[in-house]
Amino acid sequence: GSTVPPMVNVTRSEASEGNITVTCRASSFYPRNIILTWRQDGVSLSHDTQQWGDVLPDGNGTYQTWVATRICRGEEQRFTCYMEHSGNHSTHPVPSGNSHHHHHHHH
């Protein structure tokens, strides 16, 4: 099949006191190989500070996956989610406060 770029969506949720979990989800992409990882101040986070979901079919002939990490509340602006798929790449910030989901379709 032809390349379908992912929709990337960054969300935040409350974790323990003073911390939040930020999750970067990529969906509706093809082929299945995708890089999704968190950066702090432009530097990649180590594997042991991130959690990944498996790359799974989403039922439409495309795939979905996610990566999450726990950060200190108030430091959201230092973190970005990096996505690389089929030679294209993009970075996605953490939404501030209780804002809505941020969807970015990468072309």
Partner: antibody, heavy 120, light 107 residues
Framework: QVQLKESGPGLVAPSQSLSITCTVS????????VNWVRQPPGKGLEWLGM???????DYNSALKSRLSISKDNSKSQIFLKMNSLQTDDTARYYC??????????????WGAGTTVTVSS | DIQMTQTTSSLSASLGDRVTISCSAS??????LNWYQQKPDGTVKLLIY???SLPSGVPSRFSGSGSGTDYSLTISNLEPEDIATYYC?????????FGGGTKVEIK
């Protein structure tokens, strides 16, 4: 067919800088990370750093102050520059493609390496 | 940095033998471990990734296992072309670090 080939000066004088080029074929640099790894004579492997598809870089903190990695996507080339070389920088320098998929991160294809000797 | 230790620096075995190479990390690395083979001419090849996954083209006589801090590479039936030095490598924390290598020779 994925290939990487390093080219370097061979001999570098102490305190001088080192420049090595890695020329790749069979894949696009916009969609793959490339790593630099070195191996001193008779010793093990040491990761120096990497450059991502978007040009962002990560470095081994022990060498970060002396290292710079850059690339030219159109020429399919990655460049390693290291300053203030000393004799213990004598090593074989490898570039290797990185595959970074979720829980999996590995160097799936390596160049043959280029030998750099630091000596006056 | 995480220290990777391969306590056996060299070993001799006969063709057809089962060979096991051990690798220990200075802290838990959550299966974030790869194995590489370096031939006498310096050529490096990926053998095993993520503890036990075999890349395409690598013979099935190679296998990997382990968890926590202790990992191993097994060659089930030693062949002449397996004469090489084998390195483990962790990527749980940056920087990725390698073991000192285990050289396999023919008895």
């Amino acid at each position: 067919q994925v290939q990487l080939k390093e080219s370097g000066p061979g001999l570098v004088a102490p305190s001088q800088s080192l420049s090595i080029t890695c020329t790749v074929s069979g894949f696009a640099l916009t969609g793959s990370g490339v790593n630099w790894v070195r191996q001193p004579p008779g010793k093990g492997l040491e990761w120096l750093g990497m450059i991502w598809g978007d040009g962002n870089t990560d470095y081994n903190s022990a060498l970060k102050s002396r290292l710079s990695i850059s690339k030219d996507n159109s020429k399919s080339q990655i460049f390693l520059k290291m300053n203030s070389l000393q004799t213990d920088d004598t090593a074989r320098y490898y570039c290797a493609r990185g595959a970074h998929y979720g829980k999996r991160w590995y160097f799936d294809v390596w160049g043959a390496g280029t030998t750099v000797t630091v000596s006056s | 940095d995480i220290q990777m230790t391969q306590t056996t620096s060299s070993l001799s075995a006969s063709l057809g033998d089962r060979v096991t190479i051990s690798c220990s990390a200075s802290q838990g690395i959550n299966n974030y471990l790869n194995w590489y083979q370096q031939k006498p001419d310096g050529t490096v090849k990926l053998l095993i990734y993520y503890t036990s996954s075999l890349p395409s083209g690598v013979p099935s006589r190679f296998s990997g296992s382990g968890s926590g801090t202790d990992y191993s590479l097994t060659i089930s039936n030693l062949e002449p072309e397996d004469i090489a030095t084998y390195y483990c490598q962790q990527y749980s924390k940056l920087p990725p670090t390698f073991g000192g290598g285990t050289k396999v020779e023919i008895k």
